[in-house]
Interface confidence: medium
Amino acid sequence: GITIPRNPGCPNSEDKNFPRTVMVNLNIHNRNTNTNPKRSSDYYNRSTSPWNLHRNEDPERYPSVIWEAKCRHLGCINADGNVDYHMNSVPIQQEILVLRREPPHCPNSFRLEKILVSVGCTCVTPIVHHVA
Amino acid sequence: GITIPRNPGCPNSEDKNFPRTVMVNLNIHNRNTNTNPKRSSDYYNRSTSPWNLHRNEDPERYPSVIWEAKCRHLGCINADGNVDYHMNSVPIQQEILVLRREPPHCPNSFRLEKILVSVGCTCVTPIVHHVA
């Protein structure tokens, strides 16, 4: 296994006061049983609201590297391949669960954390505010 | 909290053979510190590739309720509000980590699981296969 400089403040697995602590088996089971899932791997380029992927790294988190979608344009790509500013490219956001080492550097103690990530972009009709 | 009938086969927290097991604190910390994140709440209706949200519930999973997007149309909505079948509405899929009670009904023993969810839809140019 891995040898980690252990934080002396690491909680004891048997500590009954460690709040709402559970045992979690890290052999991640993959429930994506559909043998032909429609992968979104190239949608970022083919979309009328295309996006780029930006890297966000945090060594104390699993997964340590999260690639976030950033819409390429304010508008959407029209049939001529030009940006139409009468429409808006907007990020679709989703909360995901990640694990954070807590206290930091403890090899077998984690905290669940929710973070909001942008998964991709979609093209929407803008909300127009009419001034009286 | 919820009272769950305890499975007599639940693993012992101190069992050193319980595979790749760590302690996880379930007091979920929310890192979405932006007090007004641009939520995608109404994008499902305003998108050129609109979607409906379907509820998926599983009491043995955390989170137990997951909302799944299903694209409303095969094509995309054009400027006239009609469906244009020269373009495709496609789901943007994302894997999320969830916790599954394992063995079932054990209150403090979980397994990490990856599941694929559709978060929303985007409008893409179709891939055209030319037959020789």
């Epitope: 980690i4 991640i28 791997s41 340590s64 080492r101 | 790749r20 994302q94 980590l97 990856k114």
Partner: antibody
Framework: EVQLVQSGAEVKKPGESLKISCKAS????????ISWVRQAPGQGLEWMGG????????DYAQKFQGRVTITADESTTTAYMELSGLTSDDTAVYYC???????????????????WGQGTTVTVSS | EIVLTQSPDFQSVTPKEKVTITCRAS??????LHWYQQKPGQSPKLLIK???HSISGVPSRFSGSGSGTDFTLTINGLEAEDAGTYYC?????????FGPGTKVDIK
């Protein structure tokens, strides 16, 4: 700049054990895993196993199960691969490769090997 | 385990020519397919990750496409320095596996 520096060439006898080190620099050690890949003379690449530093968890190819042990020391940012019960079939170049723990385009951990060590030549001969 | 097959095994190409290498997986692997280049006496080098994503520092003449079971690596305008062996690699499922390699040499 990311670098993986492996220990030097080894000559072993059948039945002996081998331990190769892989020292990582230029990146956060626990943000990545290390996989070990070998290449027999004139042959292709063969994945042996890997370690996810974040969890300290290991995975091994069935072919090497029971014979290979992969460990890591976070304090020295070094990973190790130990292979026991050597035979002449284990003559190969052994590489370590860095494996990101990534959430990429909506998916967890379908990982590429983004940086490789220079390789350690191992000869097993009586 | 997932078996990857590559074609061709060997290709002799003139500089500036277009090179296409294919990789087929024995089962669906989504886009968890990566391409490496290995020059004689050197370590492998990552060229393309997740089927089609380019790597910073890798020349733009290298591109990848495909998903599911069929993947392609394209070198648009081969250069002399591109001689070597190209491997595809799947990480959809343990054990991770590599294709047998395609050797490219310069005429």
């Amino acid at each position: 700049e990311v670098q993986l520096v492996q220990s030097g060439a080894e000559v072993k006898k059948p039945g002996e054990s081998l331990k190769i080190s892989c020292k990582a620099s230029g990146g956060s050690f626990i943000s990545y895993g290390i996989s070990w890949v070998r290449q027999a003379p004139g042959q292709g690449l063969e994945w042996m196993g890997g370690i996810t530093h974040f969890f300290g968890s290991t995975d091994y190819a069935q072919k090497f199960q029971g014979r290979v042990t992969i460990t890591a020391d976070e304090s020295t940012t070094t990973a190790y691969m130990e292979l026991s019960g050597l035979t002449s079939d284990d003559t190969a170049v052994y590489y370590c490769a860095r494996v990101p723990n990534e959430f990429w385009n909506g998916y967890y951990a379908t990982q590429d090997f983004d940086y490789w060590g220079q390789g350690t030549t191992v000869t097993v001969s009586s | 385990e997932i078996v990857l097959t590559q074609s061709p095994d060997f290709q002799s190409v003139t500089p500036k020519e277009k090179v296409t290498i294919t990789c087929r997986a024995s089962q669906e692997i989504g886009f968890a397919l990566h391409w490496y280049q290995q020059k004689p006496g050197q370590s492998p080098k990552l060229l393309i990750k997740y089927a089609s994503h380019s790597i910073s520092g890798v020349p733009s003449r290298f591109s990848g496409s495909g998903s599911g079971t069929d993947f392609t690596l394209t070198i648009n305008g081969l250069e002399a320095e591109d001689a070597g062996t190209y491997y595809c690699h799947q990480t959809e499922e343990l054990p991770y596996t590599f294709g047998p390699g395609t050797k490219v040499d310069i005429k």
